[in-house]
Interface confidence: medium
């Protein structure tokens, strides 16, 4: 999942301290656009004819990285992050996951981090990471991450865990937004209307996206999440959620207003781009998937054929959070007034925009997005954010 | 520069249709997802309806849905709105906005829609 | 009657500061980082002054501050002058639709 935005509004001349954060696009209110859903929920929205489009009601986790040093360094842009409601609730993940052997049929190699572009986006697959069939972009958006679609589970209720990052990051701006043709195809006229134009579908490579120059990203682990609420009346889009990438970068023209990196430097420093999942068919209950996609430096092995998660903070299991010598804090935990406590206790507000601060045992702590209705918040703290509208 | 001019407003019967235009210049059209506001007279600003960049997703209100149609001809830099069935509160200047982030850094002047008998 | 709420008027003396507050729901201030102002001169359309609550657009003066608290955001506009005066409108993402909330506009007087 994309750690930092694309394209934001216009050049931000003082940094807000809570970027915003990914949520997914709405559906498409043609009168074609999506099946009726089965009530009427407050997040949906009414397509012409009546019909009720339902917004994707899951929730998208994305990695926060968070080794002590790494924390550290960002603690002095948390302070003035503006909770949202749900921040920085601890908890603990009631699944397991699988090692990376046993979920990828790809080989497992660290990607290197594309270069910060003032328009900057994440890296794109290559054309055998079963990405989504995106169609052709905008020459002007930098397609770097978000697309790589490992399969054909339904991102929008996957989750993603970014590997802490050992070494120097380059800084991200974190106010872009990338805009998609989230339901693109839907009536039947969209490039990817196709049933077969979801990830991981056959016959859609003519709507790959130009991934010329782009280094792929690699996605590790699966966790599959068991608890990810559905709503059967929630209408997952049969056609690419890539469709169309609306890159919100300012061109030649008025590149004076876009947002670079510059800007939100104490904040982005410290985030690492990722993959990003791609969407799953239209039917039937998604399997959310969780991906572990490493920064540019690998961290060694993944633990074994499971890995263990950090129980609730509070609970019991927190001894956990000291290391052997009884000096350092493990992953996902930062010494506060000489003890180890939780990231997700100590910063209520870790996630962004509702997000949800999990700990995972050896990898640290990590946000779940929410994602639903209009606007899909992403990024390892629910800092990014996509829109189609 | 970026600039956005729409046109095509006018006064036109209950029941009448409209076709509205905005034409831009000065940035990438089909990179950019575009809206129209109206704002009627004395009154604040409404979203109306919005499109994404390669037209594929349209949004509407609940007031226009039905009766206006969003569209745009990335070739010719335009985008559209095709009002029908006008009505008496449709009456405002309508702007069109390119969107950037979740607002919308450039307007057009407006064109104004006045429907009365 | 508008999605989100703002006081019809307010008025400031020059070089004073004022605030203009914009209500909501959880449902869109409140829930996201996602408020956005606008400066409309009469017959002018409107010109984005804030997004994101509280970032400024190059060329847009720092005098001109956002922030927000709760269902509440709030739109400061300190040393005011008198070009200030002006019509004010909020905006916000709204996760119900629509999409986009507009307040229904403040009048700033400067006295």
């Known amino acids: 999942v994309p750690a930092r935005e694309a394209g934001s509004a216009v050049e931000a001349e003082e940094l807000v301290k809570g970027s915003p954060a990914w949520e997914p696009p709405a559906n498409d209110t043609r009168e074609e656009a999506g099946p009726p859903a089965a009530g009427e929920d407050e997040a949906s929205w009414t397509a012409p004819g009546g019909e009720l489009a339902g917004p994707e009601e899951v929730l998208q986790e994305s990695a926060a990285v968070t080794g002590t040093a790494w924390l550290e360094a960002d603690s002095p842009g948390l302070g003035g992050v503006t909770a949202e409601a749900g921040s920085g609730d601890a908890q603990a993940l009631p699944a397991t996951l699988q090692a990376p052997h046993e979920v990828l049929g790809q080989s497992i190699m660290p990607p290197a981090i594309p270069e910060a572009t003032e328009a900057s986006g994440p890296p794109s697959p290559t054309p055998g990471d079963k990405l989504s069939p995106a169609s052709e972009l905008p020459k002007e958006s930098p397609l770097e991450v978000w697309l790589n679609l490992g399969g054909s589970t339904p991102d929008p209720q996957g989750p993603e865990l970014t590997y802490p990052f050992q070494g120097t990051l380059e800084p991200q701006p974190a106010s872009d937004i990338i805009d998609i043709d989230y339901f693109e195809g839907l009536d039947g006229e969209g490039r990817g209307a196709d049933l077969g134009s979801f990830p991981g579908s056959p016959g859609t490579s003519e709507n790959h996206p130009d991934t010329e120059g782009e280094t792929p990203s690699w996605s590790l682990l699966d966790l599959y999440d068991d608890f990810t609420p559905f709503d059967e009346s929630d209408f997952y889009p049969t056609t690419s959620f890539y469709d169309d990438l609306d890159e919100e970068e300012e061109e030649e023209e008025d590149d004076k207003d876009a947002v670079g990196g510059g800007d939100l430097e104490d904040e982005n420093e410290l985030l690492v781009p990722t993959g990003k999942p791609g969407l799953g068919p239209g039917t039937g209950q998604p399997t959310s998937r969780w991906h572990a996609v490493p920064p540019q430096h690998t961290l060694g092995s993944v633990p074994g054929s499971s890995i263990a998660l950090r129980p609730r903070p509070g609970e019991p299991g927190r001894d956990l959070a000291s290391s052997e010598n009884g000096t350092e804090c493990r992953s996902g935990f930062v010494r506060h007034n000489g003890s180890c406590r939780s990231v997700c206790d100590l910063f209520p507000s870790y996630c962004h925009n509702g997000g949800q601060c999990y700990l995972v045992e050896n990898i640290g702590a990590f946000c779940r997005c929410n994602t639903q209705d209009y606007i899909w918040h992403k990024g390892m703290r629910c800092e990014s954010i996509i829109t189609d509208f | 520069e970026v600039q956005l001019l729409e046109s095509g407003g006018g006064l036109v019967q209950p029941g009448g249709s409209l076709r509205l235009s905005c034409a831009a210049s000065?940035?990438?059209?089909?990179?950019?997802?575009m809206s129209w506001v109206r704002q009627a007279p004395g009154k604040g600003l409404e979203w109306v309806s919005a499109?994404?960049?390669?037209?594929?997703?349209?949004y509407y209100a609940d007031s226009v849905k039905g009766r206006f149609t969003i569209s745009r001809d990335n070739s010719k830099n335009t985008l559209y709105l095709q009002m029908n069935s006008l009505r008496a509160e449709d009456t405002a200047v309508y702007y069109c906005?390119?969107?950037?982030?979740?607002?919308?850094?450039?307007w057009g002047q407006g064109t104004l829609v006045t429907v009365s008998s | 009657q508008s999605a989100l709420t703002q006081p019809a008027s307010v008025s400031g003396s020059p070089g004073q500061s004022i605030t203009i507050s914009c209500t909501g729901t959880?449902?869109?201030?409140?829930?996201?980082?996602?408020v956005s102002w606008y400066q409309q001169y009469a017959g002018k359309a409107p010109k984005l002054i804030i997004f994101?609550?509280?970032k400024r657009p190059s060329g847009v003066s720092n005098r001109f501050s956002g922030s927000k608290s709760g269902d509440t955001a709030s739109l400061t506009i300190s040393g005011l002058q008198a070009e200030d005066e002006a019509d004010y409108h909020c905006?916000?993402?709204?996760?119900?639709?629509?999409?986009?909330?507009f307040g229904g506009g403040t009048k700033l007087t400067v006295l």
């Open positions: 906005a390119k969107k950037r982030s979740l607002a919308f850094d450039y």
């Open positions: 000065g940035f990438t059209f089909s990179s950019y997802a």
């Open positions: 499109i994404s960049g390669s037209g594929g997703s349209t």
């Open positions: 959880s449902t869109d201030v409140n829930g996201y980082n996602y």
């Open positions: 994101d609550v509280s």
């Open positions: 905006s916000s993402y709204n996760r119900k639709r629509p999409p986009v909330l």
